[in-house]
């Protein structure tokens, strides 16, 4: 069976939107009005992995681009990157570990935990216009909570 996907945008708990910053990086900043068209639309795919009521494994691709968020070790540190893939093969039900995030729903907020690096989360900075990154702390300065807005395909 083909993998189930939906299109959405994400905003962090401070209502910052995510936009492209160069070819392989996302940044978070406040957008208003027509500028909201700059925000990236994700293709969220529901993939194979350990699932529970509040935890669902997903992969986060960029709509109409051959790019997926992936988590790899760089200089001994878990790192978030945008990775190009062959569009003929992606998305797929059995994604490589580095592409899988546990989408965790808590109090109407979403967290995205790396399946490869437990307790590391997609994060944004308090500051404006900073890169989206993989952070190893929740509840601290950095933001790990997001809301999801559905986009019609």
């Amino acid at each position: 069976a083909p993998v189930r996907s939906l299109h959405c945008t994400l905003r962090d708990a401070q209502l910052k939107s995510l936009v492209m910053s160069g070819p392989y990086e996302l940044k978070a900043l406040h957008l208003q009005g027509q500028d909201l068209e700059q925000q990236v639309v994700f293709s969220m795919s529901f993939v194979q992995g350990e699932e529970s009521n509040d935890k669902i494994p997903v992969a986060l691709g960029l709509k109409a681009k051959n790019l997926y968020l992936s988590c790899v070790l760089k200089d001994d540190k878990p790192t978030l990157q945008l990775e190009s893939v062959d569009p003929k093969n992606y998305p797929k039900k059995k994604m490589e570990k580095r592409f899988v995030f546990n989408k965790i729903e808590i109090n109407n907020k979403l967290e995205f935990e790396s399946a490869q690096f437990p307790n590391w989360y997609i994060s944004t900075s308090q500051a404006e216009n900073m890169p989206v990154f993989l952070g190893g702390t929740r509840g601290g300065q950095d933001i790990t909570d997001f809301t999801m807005q559905f986009v019609s395909s």
Epitope: V72, V85, D86, A115, Q116, P118
Partner: antibody, heavy 120, light 107 residues
Framework: QVQLVESGGGVVQPGRSLRLSCAFS??????????VGWIRQAPGKGLEWVAH???????SYADSVKGRFTISKDNSKNTVYLQMNSLRAEDTAVYFC????????????WGQGTLVTVSS | DIQMTQSTSSLSASVGDRVTITCRAS??????LSWYQQKPGKAVKLLIY???KLHSGVPSRFSGSGSGTDYTLTISSLQQEDFATYFC?????????FGQGTKLEIK
Amino acid sequence: QVQLVESGGGVVQPGRSLRLSCAFSGFSLSTSGMGVGWIRQAPGKGLEWVAHIWWDGDESYADSVKGRFTISKDNSKNTVYLQMNSLRAEDTAVYFCARNRYDPPWFVDWGQGTLVTVSS
Amino acid sequence: DIQMTQSTSSLSASVGDRVTITCRASQDISNYLSWYQQKPGKAVKLLIYYTSKLHSGVPSRFSGSGSGTDYTLTISSLQQEDFATYFCLQGKMLPWTFGQGTKLEIK
């Protein structure tokens, strides 16, 4: 230091089953990011990745063995298994287990291998 | 599946030679490539990972390079103990696939 030792190989008839074991020491397969794979080498041929299991139980298989082979682990025994059913002549090979950490994989430590011969 | 091609199945060289072994992927593998050495009766050894990173304990005469689809293992000055078979492995996409191997023989 890390050691991996394969066992369970032997001669088996086509269509029959065999279970290989990979006993390891020097690391724990409950450590996050850790994985163990099975790789085989047919006589006089190159290496072929067969199956893999991650610390969290996530499994992957080569198309050539999907539905016939099952990889599993027993963390308390520090052992990974490869259950091989419906064996075919083309499964004849030396089977190695190897350890990796994180995806993308590079296999850091390897065992010496165990020979499986499928023949009537 | 991603095909990995080591176009040279065997290579003859002498001690002290500089040797390059190549590996070509059927699509871009994002530098997710590792190199292994195999000798008869010995455990397989990891030499290079992530295209160019030298695994601990591996002599510095071994180096790796490449990007996209084309990758190279170089031995700067061949030693007696380097005569062996060398394999590449791509980790970009499941199923993970090896090259067919290049056997390095004494000239």
